[in-house]
Structures are given as C-alpha cells and as structure tokens.
C-alpha cells in the first residue's frame, strides 16, 4: 500500500523556526501510529544523514547550527510491508536563524489597526537579502516568504497582513536569507506587535480631579467598563508608547484601572482600550478622546501626533 | 564609496606559510560574507570559499579544505586568508570578494611559491 | 557540483558589433548567476547579478538574460575598453562555479 494513505505526517515542534544553539522535536505521525521511524535531510544527495538511526516518536534535534538547516522527510516503521517501511512523508523546512544581521520590521500604516483593515508589514535591510521571510510568534505553519527588492542599497519586501481578524493579532518578527543557503535565517527583526482595536465596546475614560488642570497637580485617568476587560491601555496622541494596567472589578459591578499621570506639566489628548488576557493582542473599541489641559503652564506644545507604538510587548501576557 | 584593498605580492619558499590581508571599506562590514577566489597563471578563477563575517564561520570548497583557513579581524574591518605548508601549485592571484554575487573584489594579491 | 559551460572560450569582434558570450548550467540555478570582466593588472568587475541586473556604474550596452539553466551576456555595441576575459559564476549552491572564461579581443 504506497501513496497518501500510507505517508505519514512530519512536523516540527516549537517550530520550523530554530535559533541557533536551540533544540526543535521532529515527530513521525501516521494514522496508525508508528513507534519507529526514520529521518532523512534533502540534501541533492538524498542520503539519510541519520545514517539509518531509527527514532521513537519524536527526535529532538539539537544544538541546531546552519547545517541543520533544510528539508527532512520521515518513514514510518510498518512490519508487515515488503520494505518495511512507508512511504516518505511531507517535506519539511527546518530553517535556523541567527546566520546575518537582523533586519528592520515597520508597519504601515502603523501597528494599531482596526478590524478588517489590511497593515503592510515591511521586512528591511541594508544587508541585500535575497528572500525575507515573516514569521508569527506561536505559530508553527512555514513563514511567508518573499524574494526581495534592492533599491538603492537597501533590499525589502512587503507583506500585506488583511483583511484583519482577531487570529491575525500578534507578534511578528521577519528574518532574510540569501541565495545559496536560502534556509539559513539571519538573526530576527525585533518584534513588532500587531493590534486589532474594535472588536469590543469601548471602555469609558475620566480624569480626576478633572479634565482642566493646574500646572503641577496630579491627575489621574480613570479608564472603566462594565465588560470584563483583564487588562486597560492607556494611549496619548504624540507618545510612542501606552501603559498598560491590569483591570480590577469595582463594587458597583464595573471594571476599572487608574493610570497616575503625576504631577500636570503638559496637557494631551488620550484614548483608553480594554482587553482580555486569552487575546492581548485583540483591544476594543477605542474610549471617547479626552482632551486634558493644563492651566498655567506657558509651555504646552506636543509632539506631531504618532500612533501609539507597539513595540514593547504588548502582546505578551501582563503578570 | 566601497573598497576592498588587499596586502602586497608575496614570494615564499615551499612549506612556509602566507597570511593574505583584505581590508574593507565603504561599507558595514559584518553585512556581507567575504568569499576568497584563486587565479592561477594562465588559469581561469576559482572559488575557494566564503566566511560568514557575522558568525565568524568560514566555508571552504572541496580543493581547499586542510591547507587554508580565513579568518576576521571585525573590529579592523579585514578580512583574511592563510595557507600552510606552501606549494608550487598554489602559486597564483588570489582575490577577496564581497557578498553573496561577488558584488566588489580586492586588487588580488599574487603569491609565489618557489625555491 | 555545478558545472558552468561558457563558449565561445575565445573570439575576435570588431568595434560596434554586437557580441554574445553565453553559460550553460549543469543543472537549474534559478537566476543566481553574475557575469564578471577581468583585465591585466586590474581587479575585476562585476558587470550583472541576478542574471539580468546590472551593477551601478556598468555602461547600459552590457545585458544579461536567462534562466534556469541557460545564460547570456550581450554587449550591444563594442567598444574598445570592453576587451577582456569574461565569467559568469553561479551562486545558487555552495561550491560556487565559475564558467572556464571567454577571452573577447578586438578584430
């Protein structure tokens, strides 16, 4: 019985993507369950470099170097076959990172998106890379890939990520490679955390004492809601960063994070998110703009306004 | 604009050894591989292999494993390539080139191999 | 490891002619292929990448076109600084090849 139904199924468990130094478990599956297999990497050769070693369950390969890097295939052990063994399996990428200098990762328009809209992700450097590739922290599917353009000393690629939706929400991170060891990754961009805002009703923002203030008095935003939301960002149009603060249930039934801005130098207008702690990268509905303004205070020039930046970690659990 | 300048001709006796320099310029240099390529008299070019100026980790081609060895200095941007035990037939040009298609090379630095 | 066939190894072209130097691949290489001049005394120059990417700076009569195992370098019209040895090299796998040269001299 050769073919589909006798070829098991490779894969690779965190992920495709290995750093160097790093372990990765290859796992044989077959419908029927194998106890046994067998490892070959695709080199133009086609020789098992596992020199006829026979596995159980799952290999866990590693400390994985460039060489590691490539395409395997399994067979499972089957007793009563005329080989004695199945048919190879899918092909499998395994592709080690850390080989050249990080790229560049930017979205645009920016990383805070509403729902159904469409970012492009740009993977760049000034190392020319022949491919760039965009990898989604937590998943274990292959990364896009995209052969990339030089221009003017610089090599980049494109990805466009759309229409969004909560399962597109994440990190992201893109690597590059270049031609004659296309699966030998250099080092990751820094992460670039994508947000989907819209998906839930906005939350509701106040400050205290007031929204008009003294120069030097302390306020308080007050940012709430009678959804159950885990975590509050708290936004001002020209900062590149939010806060974030973990939401706690009020006795009248609502849930609700003060974010002390301290002592009033500068006014600005802020915006509130709420999210759940399942999908910290999915926010709601942003929160009315509220416009603080400080009294007093000759020097109330802001900075052009940006989009919030979400650079640093927003999609990773707050503890 | 972006240079790669090698060291001078060198004249060795079999068995010695020759340290070839090829210092870079113009550019980051732990951007782009450095590959090192061998023109014999009268011959055409030979590939002899590259290092990973990155990683520090060099690759060397088939003809070109045990005698040869590259090298990096990063902090000096140079790059470099060594032969032991010298022999006759290694006398040639040999060049330092740069990036995955040999976008720039070096002058070439003839080393002559003789009694 | 690939093997790169270049022909002709050697020809005679007058000034203004179009001339054609071509590579032939062992096996496929995709478009990894470069075309370089190399001249006494001087070091060489790459000319194309890509297989039809011209590097800055390199004159628009040299061209280069193909894929997959078949390769050429194309100059519209020559000139007399053109004259040289030509390679074409293959960086789609590691040994990278180099094709055994053509020498193009002026009639």
């Known amino acids: 019985l050769m073919g589909g139904q006798d070829k098991p199924f490779l894969s690779a468990r965190p992920s495709t993507v290995v750093p160097r130094g790093g372990h990765v478990a290859l796992q044989c599956h077959y419908r029927r369950g194998f106890n046994n297999f067998m490892l070959y990497k695709e080199d133009r050769s086609h020789v098992p470099i596992f020199h006829g070693r026979i596995f159980q369950e799952s290999f866990i390969m590693g400390p994985v170097t460039p060489a590691h890097a490539g395409t395997y295939r399994c067979r499972g052990s089957r007793p009563h076959s005329l080989t004695g063994w199945s048919a190879p399996s899918n092909p499998l990428v395994i592709m080690v990172t850390g080989n050249h200098r990080k790229p560049s990762l930017l979205a645009h328009p920016g990383p805070l998106l509403k729902s159904g809209e469409t970012v492009i992700l740009q993977c760049w450097s000034d190392v020319m890379f022949e491919h760039f590739f965009l990898h989604k922290e937590g998943i274990s599917k292959d990364p896009s890939r995209l052969v990339g353009q030089i221009h003017d000393g610089v090599s980049k690629a494109n990805f466009s990520i759309g229409p969004l939706m909560p399962v597109l929400a994440g990190t992201y991170r893109c690597y590059g490679s270049v031609p004659h060891s296309p699966y030998q990754l250099s080092a990751p961009s820094d992460p670039l955390d994508i947000v989907i805002t819209g998906l839930y009703e906005k939350p509701s923002l106040s400050a205290q004492p007031g929204p008009t203030v003294q120069a030097g008095e302390n306020v308080t935003l007050s940012c709430s809601s009678w959804s159950s939301y885990d975590i509050y960002h708290l936004s001002r149009e020209g900062e590149a960063h939010e806060r974030r603060l973990r939401a706690v249930p009020k006795v009248n039934r609502t849930f609700q994070a003060d974010f002390p801005l301290g002592p009033a130098t500068h006014g600005g207008t802020y915006r509130c998110f709420g999210s759940f702690r399942a999908l910290p990268c999915v926010w709601s509905n942003s929160s009315d703009p509220l416009l603080v303004s400080v009294t007093g205070n000759p020097s109330s020039s802001w900075p052009s306004p940006t989009e919030p930046s979400s650079k640093s970690g927003i999609c990773r659990h707050l503890h | 604009q972006i240079q790669l300048v090698q060291s001078g001709p060198e004249l060795k006796n079999p068995g010695e050894t020759v340290k070839i320099s090829c210092k870079a310029s113009?550019?980051?240099?732990?951007?782009?591989?450095m590959n090192w390529v061998k023109q014999a008299p009268g011959k055409g070019l030979k590939w002899m292999g590259w290092i990973n100026t990155y990683t520090g980790e060099p690759t060397y081609a088939d003809d070109f494993k045990g005698r040869f060895a590259f090298s990096l200095e990063t902090s000096a941007s140079t790059a470099y390539l060594q032969i032991n035990n010298l022999k006759n037939e290694d006398t040639a040009t040999y060049f330092c080139?740069?990036?995955?298609?040999?976008?720039?090379w070096g002058q070439g630095t003839l080393v002559t191999v003789s009694t | 490891d690939i093997k790169m066939t270049q022909s002709p190894s050697s020809m005679y072209a007058s000034l203004g002619e179009r001339v054609t130097i071509t590579c032939k691949a062992s096996?496929?290489?995709?478009?990894?292929l470069s075309w370089f001049q190399l001249k006494p005394g001087k070091s060489p120059k790459t000319l194309i990448y890509r297989a039809n990417r011209l590097v800055d700076g390199v004159p628009s009569r040299f061209s280069g076109s193909g894929s997959g195992q078949d390769f050429s370098l194309t100059i519209s019209s020559l000139e007399c600084e053109d004259m040289g040895i030509y390679y074409c090299?293959?960086?789609?796998?590691?040994?990278?090849?180099f094709g055994g040269g053509t020498t193009l001299e002026i009639k």
């Open positions: 113009g550019y980051i240099f732990t951007n782009y591989g």
């Open positions: 080139a740069h990036g995955p298609w040999l976008a720039y």
């Open positions: 090299l293959q960086y789609d796998e590691l040994p990278y090849t």
């Open positions: 096996q496929d290489i995709n478009s990894y």
